[in-house]
């Protein structure tokens, strides 16, 4: 797209070729500037410098307007105008590309006085030689410390000239650094050559841990030697703890086999387990910024000497594209059991999953599924629907991965596939599922529960039924009654107790004759319609000493509804102070239609019922 030309204005110190201010304001990138307002409105645009000389000035422009100026627009501006632009960019915190920063720096020919007013990252592109005096260089490098050095690649000339100048400025002689020196260098400390690492390991290694890019060969060798030497701050590898491993995270790629072998095996195992189980311990994978086309090329070829011969811990130091290129899918499938012991990042696990998906597009075989371990968490329900899981061991292995968490859609799908494959929810399966998910049984619909054979009920523990609703217990209770029918009274009650929410009145009446002392928790879960017909004496016998709890529960169902059905005289015999029973002299007419509608019995008070009472009295006297 051609740059729109502009006619010169009086007082302009730029040239007509500069293009328009509007172009500067609204273009959004280097390569494809967007259409200008000038083009859309038919007005001719004024040169950039001409407009800067008049309001609105640069500082009044919005960050979006300042975002994507091309270098060509700046090259014709006066140094003063460039400085103004740089200050405006800093004030509005506009994020600039490397090219824009380089361009601005190039135009700020003389060293700026007010470094604090300029964008931080712009300083990286200024020549440090321009700040040669002790005060000037200190001011300059104090600001550089806060800049993002990694905007510049390691080999960039601007970056290479910064470190020697910084060392000179801070008065560092030789390779011995203090903690203050390392702090003063900021991100530049990551560029210190191996000799500094060797001589200043104690202060430098903790800084290198957090360097974003990989260390160069020279630095790696020095770090490895320092760590193996066992000096401060980490001490000998044989004394490392899990927290040492955490502290060393960024340096783990430099550890060689000799160091790894020196670390106590229990520590390595504990650290691996922790970092593979807890997402918060997983480092976001470091990526080295490189042009996309190069990455795509590199993805296809495995670097020499990196081809994986087996699945081992050395792979945690591979970048995603290296895993993709260097790990054979068939090797991965045969050694899946090893993946679990290795603390791969979630991004790395994505790569491994992708390899398995390519190898088994129709779904993984059970031999692979059984050893998925934490890779199972990467599977979608759609992936799982392709599987045919028949072994209880496989099911257990995968449920173990999700242990302690809510049932995920993946787990639900897995269980569904497994149960459908088996045809019914047998005892072993139910045993396994309720061990991992105590609420599993109550997550099934009454229809699904109807396929549970009575023999499976033996696997159910009381806590497995905690969240079941009455409809579910209605289905489970008859099965439990059948399952436990051959047990003696006391054992039977212990087993049936948690299913009683589905019991009918007759069964509760029978239990009340057996001195069972049902606890209040069980009583409160009984069906209201099953409790209502029980007499005060039956409830007292059913509950034993637990009857004392009725007062505390008198406002809750089913106790509330039961009290409303009892004669107050009978309730008073309990000595619990229960109130709300039918007063003396009242008749209860069990009009089932009325009760069905209101949920309470129909009471006829003294007024309307006098005639009935008189008749009853007369007949009694007669």
């Amino acid at each position: 797209m051609a740059l729109p030309t502009a006619r010169p204005l009086l007082g302009s110190c730029g040239t007509p070729a500069l293009g328009s201010l509007l172009f500067l304001l609204f273009s959004l990138g280097w390569v494809q500037p967007s259409r200008t307002l000038a083009g859309e409105t038919g007005q001719e645009a004024a040169p950039l410098d001409g407009v800067l000389a008049n309001p609105p000035n640069i500082s009044s422009l919005s960050p979006r307007q300042l975002l994507g100026f091309p270098c060509a627009e700046v090259s014709g501006l006066s140094t003063e105008r460039v400085r103004e632009l740089a200050v405006a960019l800093a004030q509005k915190n506009v994020k600039l590309s490397t090219e824009q920063l380089r361009c601005l720096a190039h135009r700020l020919s003389e060293p700026p006085e007010d470094l604090d007013a300029l964008p931080l990252d712009l300083l990286l592109f200024l020549n440090p030689d321009a700040f040669s005096g002790p005060q000037a260089c200190t001011r300059f490098f104090s600001r550089i410390t806060k800049a993002n050095v990694d905007l510049l690649p390691r080999g960039a000339p601007e970056r290479q000239r910064l470190l020697p100048a910084a060392l000179a400025c801070w008065g560092v002689r030789g390779s011995l650094l203090s903690e203050a020196d390392v702090r003063a260098l900021g991100g530049l400390a990551c560029d210190l050559p191996g000799r500094f690492v060797a001589e200043s390991a104690e202060v430098l290694l903790p800084r290198l841990v957090s360097c974003p890019g990989p260390l160069d060969q020279d630095q790696q060798e020095a770090a490895r030697a320092a760590l193996q030497g066992g000096g401060p701050p980490y001490g000998p590898p044989s004394t490392w703890s899990v927290s040492t491993m955490d502290a060393l995270r960024g340096l783990l790629p430099v550890l060689g086999q000799p160091i790894i072998r020196s670390i106590p095996q229990g520590i390595v195992a504990a650290w691996r387990q922790r970092s593979s189980r807890d997402p918060s311990w997983r480092q976001p994978e470091r990526t080295i910024l490189r042009p996309r086309f190069r990455r795509e090329v590199e993805k296809t070829a495995c670097p020499s000497g990196k081809k994986a011969r087996e699945i081992d811990e050395s792979l945690i130091f591979y970048k995603k594209w290296e895993l993709e290129a260097c790990v054979d899918a068939a090797l991965l499938a045969t050694q899946m059991d090893r993946v679990n012991a290795i603390p791969f990042t979630y991004e790395q696990l994505d790569v491994l999953k992708h390899k398995l998906d390519e190898l088994y597009p129709q779904g993984y075989p059970e031999s692979v599924i059984q050893h998925l371990g934490y890779l199972f968490l990467k599977m979608s329900p759609e992936d799982i629907r392709k599987w045919n899981v028949t072994s209880l061991e496989t099911l257990k292995a995968l449920l173990e991965v999700n242990k302690g968490h809510e049932m995920s859609p993946q787990v639900a799908t897995l269980i569904d596939r497994f149960v459908k494959g088996r045809g019914q929810l047998d005892k072993d399966t139910l045993d396994t599922l309720t061990a991992f998910y105590p609420g599993y049984l109550c997550s099934l619909s009454p229809e699904e529960l109807s396929s549970v054979p009575p023999s499976s009920i033996w696997a159910v523990r009381p806590q497995d039924l905690d969240t079941c609703d009455p409809r579910q217990l209605d289905v489970l209770y008859p099965k439990a009654r059948l399952a436990f029918q051959n047990m003696n009274g006391s054992e039977y009650f212990v087993k049936i107790q948690s299913f009683l929410g589905g019991a009918p009145t007759e069964d509760l009446k029978a239990l009340s004759q057996q001195n069972v002392s049902m606890d209040l928790a069980t009583f409160m879960k009984l069906r209201t319609d099953a409790v209502l017909p029980l007499t005060v004496a039956e409830v007292q016998k059913l509950l034993g000493p637990h009857v004392e709890g009725l007062k505390a529960e008198e406002r809750h169902r089913p106790v509330r509804d039961w009290i409303l059905r009892q004669r107050q005289d009978d309730l008073d015999t309990l000595g619990l102070g229960l109130q709300g029973g039918i007063p003396n002299g009242y008749l209860v007419l069990d009009l089932s239609m009325q009760e069905a509608l209101s949920g309470t019995p129909c009471l006829l008070g003294p007024g309307p019922v006098l005639t009935v009472l008189a008749l009853l009295l007369a007949s009694t006297l007669a």
């Epitope: 606890d519 034993g544 000595g575």
Partner: antibody, heavy 123, light 107 residues
Framework: EVKLVESGGGLVQPGGSLSLSCAAS????????MSWVRQPPGRALEWLGF??????????EYSASVKGRFTISRDYSQSILYLHMNALRAEDSATYSC??????????????WGTGTTVTVSS | DIVMTQSQKFMSTSVGDRVSVTCKAS??????VAWYQQKPGLSPKVLIH???YRFSGVPDRFTGSGSGTDFTLSISNVQSEDLAKYFC?????????FGAGTKLELK
């Protein structure tokens, strides 16, 4: 601090009477069931009975072994629990403790105990 | 009356050991059993209700089990502060009855 302190123990002759007190503090006395428990030397704890709370009308429940001889009452204005013992026998010799009988989450249990007062029945 | 029998008056143990205190009811009491701990000079403290449910605040090294007539209080990884008297109580029927207690001592 929730606390129960018994008093009134001592030596009494067979057939005699004695009244024990239990001063409660740190909780709303009228809301709770209060119980008496005793432990004869070298034997198990024995529950004697309880008096229910205000909401239950301060009704009582006794163990068959003391029913008719022992009476539990309370002075709710003073937060004091009493055990009135009549027709005492040698086998009533024990350390007598009061305890709060508490109901929570559908379960009853003794959650606060006094340190006890000793009663010796001997001629 | 239901008699709760704790056959062992004393039990010796070492710190770190696992120990089991037993209690037998003379008739079926379902799971209506509580366990208490009493340290010298202090009032009893409830540990377990409904035979196997720990009260809040009770360390998970204390575990209750059993139903019907046989009940057990297990303490895994015994700590010095666990040296005390332990007794069971049934609340299946009146009168409420207690076991005589088992005193846990250091070997």
């Amino acid at each position: 601090e929730v606390k129960l302190v018994e008093s009134g123990g001592g030596l009494v002759q067979p057939g005699g009477s004695l009244s024990l007190s239990c001063a409660a503090s740190g909780f709303t006395f009228t809301d709770y069931y209060m119980s008496w428990v005793r432990q004869p030397p070298g034997r198990a704890l024995e529950w004697l009975g309880f008096i229910r709370g205000k909401a239950n009308g301060y009704t009582t429940e006794y163990s068959a072994s003391v029913k008719g001889r022992f009476t539990i009452s309370r002075d709710y204005s003073q937060s004091i629990l009493y055990l009135h013992m009549n027709a005492l026998r040698a086998e009533d010799s024990a350390t007598y403790s009061c305890a709060r009988y508490y109901y929570s989450n559908y379960v009853w249990y003794f959650d606060v105990w006094g340190t006890g007062t000793t009663v010796t029945v001997s001629s | 009356d239901i008699v709760m029998t704790q056959s062992q008056k004393f039990m010796s143990t070492s710190v770190g050991d696992r120990v089991s205190v037993t209690c037998k009811a003379s008739q079926n009491v379902g799971t209506n059993v509580a366990w208490y701990q009493q340290k010298p000079g202090l009032s009893p403290k409830v540990l377990i209700h409904s035979a196997s449910y720990r009260f809040s605040g009770v360390p998970d090294r204390f575990t209750g089990s059993g139903s019907g007539t046989d009940f057990t209080l297990s303490i895994s990884n015994v700590q010095s502060e666990d040296l005390a008297k332990y007794f069971c109580q049934q609340y299946n029927s009146y009168p409420l009855t207690f076991g005589a207690g088992t005193k846990l001592e250091l070997k």
